[in-house]
């Protein structure tokens, strides 16, 4: 396949990535699947600059990102290293809070209304952001 040179319609370009901002909500797994079907992934935040960009577009609304600890350690969906990477948790988060009646632990990360991150029950129907890299080879065959 050929490399993408511009973002799909209704996606926003920023720093060689394309972003799509939902206007409805889905559980984390459904949001993750939606992005994959678009040949993308839930947003992976790698810098303060990218954090500010995403925050500007989502506003003060709880929004899923591509970070979870459903299998133990925190992991970014694209394989970006969590331990050495950018983090922007709210104070005392993540707490993987189990002491509630909300169906197990809090295994999925989201942007809160002030942009900082919190871990929450993955079933909540939050909005979400998909991201895909412009340099990634597209699935479309090259034009002859």
């Amino acid at each position: 396949g050929s490399e993408r040179t511009c973002c799909p319609v209704n996606w926003v370009e920023h720093e060689r990535s394309c972003y799509w901002f939902s206007r409805s909500g889905k559980a984390w797994a459904d949001a993750d699947n939606y992005c994959r079907l678009e040949d993308a992934h839930l947003v992976v935040v790698t810098s303060w600059e990218e954090q500010k960009f995403v925050q500007h577009h989502i506003g003060p609304v709880n929004t899923w990102m591509g970070l979870h600890d459903q299998n133990g350690p925190w992991k970014w969906v694209d394989g970006t290293d969590y331990e050495t990477g950018f983090k922007n948790w709210r104070p005392e988060q993540p707490d993987d809070w189990y002491g509630h009646g909300l169906g197990g632990g809090e295994d999925c990360a989201h942007f809160t209304d002030d942009g900082r991150w919190n871990d929450d029950v993955c079933q909540r129907p939050y909005r979400w952001v998909c991201e895909t890299e412009l340099d990634k080879a597209s699935q479309e065959p090259p034009l002859l």
Epitope: G99, G103, E106, D113, Q123
Partner: antibody, heavy 126, light 107 residues
Framework: QVQLVQSGAEVKKPGASVKVSCKAS????????INWVRQATGQGLEWMGW????????GYAQKFQGRVTMTWNTSKSTAYMELSSLRSEDTAVYYC???????????????????WGQGTTVTVSS | DIQMTQSPSSLSASVGDRVTITCRAS??????LGWYQQKPGKAPKRLIC???SLQSGVPSRFSGSGSGTEFTLTISSLQPEDFATYFC?????????FGPGTKVDIK
């Protein structure tokens, strides 16, 4: 037993604000959501939003965005809903309801509002 | 927002009757739907979650079915204490939305 007890009836003038309280007992307050739902006389139920005292998260229905604020005092196990710029259409009974995700074996999670307050009547009249 | 509609808006029935109430969603909500019962002057009470799962303590004459956009609440044999208003609630997306309600009264 688990219960939510709400503050008493209020009469307010248009343009004013009202703050309704909801005191939880019989369970760990920070372990569940609190939802706020209202019902005008003879009308249906209208979901206003939710808050979670553990995470600090809140979510408001767009219709009330900018006019509603949901807060809580953990030490008092009490949730509050404040509605500002009141108009006559805000005359209603306001309910708080405990919410959580219930697990059905093999079927995922489903949200339930299992315990409700007795309701607080708010009348807006000049 | 997801719109919920209910039919009928009211119905008259006798004790022992089989009663069916329908709730429709404006888009696919899978089975993210609950049914609530409300009596005059009282707070709502949960009956069914996940479209078909009976809450503990709720009599077995109540049942729910459906998924996607169409859902049904059935009372197999109406009892005197069942005369009330019934609401559906979707929790598939924020804002959660209730149906307008179905009032069941005595014929």
């Amino acid at each position: 037993q688990v219960q939510l007890v709400q503050s008493g009836a209020e009469v307010k003038k248009p343009g004013a604000s009202v703050k309704v309280s909801c005191k939880a007992s019989g369970y760990t307050f920070t372990s569940y959501d609190i939802n706020w739902v209202r019902q005008a006389t003879g009308q249906g139920l209208e979901w206003m939003g939710w808050m979670n005292p553990n995470s600090g998260n809140t979510g408001y229905a767009q219709k009330f965005q900018g006019r509603v604020t949901m807060t809580w005092n953990t030490s008092k196990s009490t949730a509050y809903m404040e509605l500002s710029s009141l108009r006559s259409e805000d005359t209603a009974v306001y309910y708080c309801a405990r919410g959580f995700y219930d697990t059905l074996t093999g079927s995922g999670y489903y949200y339930v509002m299992d315990v409700w307050g007795q309701g607080t009547t708010v009348t807006v009249s000049s | 927002d997801i719109q919920m509609t209910q039919s009928p808006s009211s119905l008259s029935a006798s004790v022992g009757d089989r009663v069916t109430i329908t709730c429709r969603a404006s888009q696919d909500i899978r089975n993210d739907l609950g049914w609530y019962q409300q009596k005059p002057g009282k707070a709502p009470k949960r009956l069914i979650c996940a479209a078909s799962s009976l809450q503990s303590g709720v009599p077995s004459r109540f049942s729910g079915s459906g998924s996607g956009t169409e859902f049904t609440l059935t009372i197999s044999s109406l009892q005197p204490e069942d005369f009330a208003t019934y609401f559906c609630l979707q929790h598939n997306d924020y804002p959660f939305t209730f149906g307008p309600g179905t009032k069941v009264d005595i014929k």
